[in-house]
């Protein structure tokens, strides 16, 4: 009963985690304009992995996709890759774990097979969670570096006469969503791995056979054979996120002339 609960809970926690990783990956607010100690501007800038947006005081929001691959920073590409790998692994893990659930009966599937599948999905969730945490952390590190670099030369001007305000960016909501989601997926994966141990069949109870050797009496019990952990999945890694960039040059948030809430 405890094993089933652990497995079920691990599945649910991982499911929430992966949903969070997908949400974080799609969110536009990975970095948001730093408003602290900054001149008060009537526009608010924020950026995601796939596009950057500007919200005006009027409420008009304009988002532009990053239509170049080669022109993007390598770190951003790496973060994208980590998040997508995390989503793909998580999605496969979810698929595997559905069949591994003790409460679901599929034909005459052995407990050993379910144990293998549970362990496999658990490992996938752990790696998925780590990918998400790594992706978000790399992006956060990039932000911190850029923040202090732009603080060093916050105002750049010609002879101090004309000043240009440098927009500084700080942590956006997506980073926190990503960290929490990655953590949940990781915890879910650990729970699945723990559940796997309970799912594995106990030692096979054979009758002890006595072999009489000269001068000694030796009893030999064949030990219970644990199932192999090599669960083979030939599910192909499909890219399940297409980049999220719109094909339009500008995306307006509403059809009317003005709109703010």
């Amino acid at each position: 009963m405890a094993v089933t609960a652990c497995q079920g809970l691990g599945f649910v926690v991982s499911l929430i985690g992966i949903a969070g990783i997908i949400a974080a990956t799609c969110m536009d607010q990975w970095s948001t304009q730093d408003l602290y100690n900054n001149p008060v501007t009537a526009v608010f800038n924020y950026q995601g992995l796939w596009r950057s947006c500007v919200r005006e005081s009027s409420g008009f929001t304009e988002c532009r996709g990053y239509f170049t691959l080669l022109g993007l920073p390598a770190m951003l590409q790496a973060v994208r890759a980590l998040m997508i790998v995390g989503i793909v692994l998580g999605a496969i893990g979810l698929l595997v774990s559905i069949f591994a659930l003790k409460c679901i009966r599929i034909g005459s599937m052995e407990d050993s097979a379910k144990a293998n599948m549970t362990l496999t999905s658990g490992i996938m969730f752990i790696v998925s969670g780590l990918c998400a945490i790594a992706g978000v952390s790399v992006f956060a590190n990039m932000l911190v570096t850029n923040f202090w670099m732009s603080t060093a030369n916050m105002y750049t001007g010609m002879g101090g006469m004309v000043q240009t305000v440098q927009t500084r960016y700080t942590f956006g909501a997506a980073l926190f969503v990503g960290w929490v989601a990655g953590g949940l997926t990781l915890i879910g994966g650990v729970m699945m791995c723990i559940a796997c141990r309970g799912l594995a069949p106990e030692e096979t109870n054979y009758k002890a056979v006595s072999y009489h050797a000269s001068g000694h009496s030796v009893a030999y019990k064949p030990g219970g054979f644990k199932a192999s952990t090599g669960f083979g999945s030939n599910t192909k890694n499909k890219k399940i996120y297409d980049g999220g960039a719109r094909t339009e040059d500008e995306v307006q948030s509403y059809p009317s002339k003005h709109d703010y809430v």
Epitope: A42, E56, S58, G59, V162, V165, H258, Y260, V261
Partner: antibody, heavy 118, light 113 residues
């Protein structure tokens, strides 16, 4: 079409208060921020500030804090500018205007002349 | 506060001729996020409220004749009337719409020579 209709001219004595209204029609009132602009006789335009008609939050320009208060009544689809402790230098035409693309002032009221004289 | 300086203060141009009004801001009005300049141009005729002509420094408001055009970036902006018409006689204002407060230029009075 979008229209902003302001209240009529006011003649006030120094120290009195005045409340200028700006009634909006032709759009969802809370979708537009309402700006207030002052124009003294023969002078240029002076941006006083604006009110977010959805949240009720106001932003005031430096010279317009204290005696000047922006408010709005969503049900009446009306924005208000109240000026207390009137001074002679408050004599001006007061315009209301909505925020548009690029934070521009897209639609304007016809203006309300407030005259402060003893 | 951002200081908006228009030049000239007044301008007399013959009908059909080109009129150019300049506006300079004390800080850049270019937003790096969308590469747009938050500068607006208005036209005010005597006894009337101002009328929006151009926003984002160069985007013409719908219904505004195409003889009106805006250009410039950062701190230096220009309003050009390619062929002056009698109805264009007015005072023209530029406005900063990037930093609070949204300061106006002092205005440029356009007359017919």
């Amino acid at each position: 079409q979008i229209q902003l209709v302001q209240s009529g001219s006011e003649l006030k004595k120094p120290g009195e208060s005045v409340k200028v209204s700006c009634k909006a029609s032709g759009y969802t009132f809370t979708n537009y921020g309402m700006n207030w602009v002052r124009q003294a006789p023969g002078q240029g335009l002076e941006w006083m500030g604006w009110i977010n008609t959805y949240t009720g939050e106001s932003t005031y320009a430096d010279g317009f804090t204290g005696r000047f208060v922006f408010s709005s009544d969503t049900s009446a689809r009306t924005a208000y500018l109240q000026i207390s402790s009137l001074k002679a230098e408050d004599t001006a035409v007061y315009f209301c205007a909505t925020l548009g693309y690029g934070n521009s002032l897209a639609y304007w009221g016809q203006g309300t002349l407030v005259t402060v004289s003893s | 506060d951002i200081v908006m300086t228009q030049s000239p203060d007044s301008l007399a141009v013959s009908l059909g001729e080109r009129a150019t009004i300049n506006c300079k801001s004390s800080q850049s009005l270019l937003n790096s996020g969308n590469q747009r300049n938050y500068l607006t141009w208005y036209q005010q005729k005597p006894g009337q409220p101002p009328k929006l002509l151009i926003y984002w420094a160069s985007t013409r408001e719908s219904g505004v004749p195409d003889r009106f055009s805006g250009s410039g970036s950062g701190t230096d902006f220009t309003l050009t009337i390619s062929s002056l018409q009698a109805e264009d006689v007015a005072v023209y204002y530029c406005q900063n719409n990037y930093f609070y407060p949204f300061t106006f230029g002092q205005g440029t009075k356009l007359e017919i020579k």
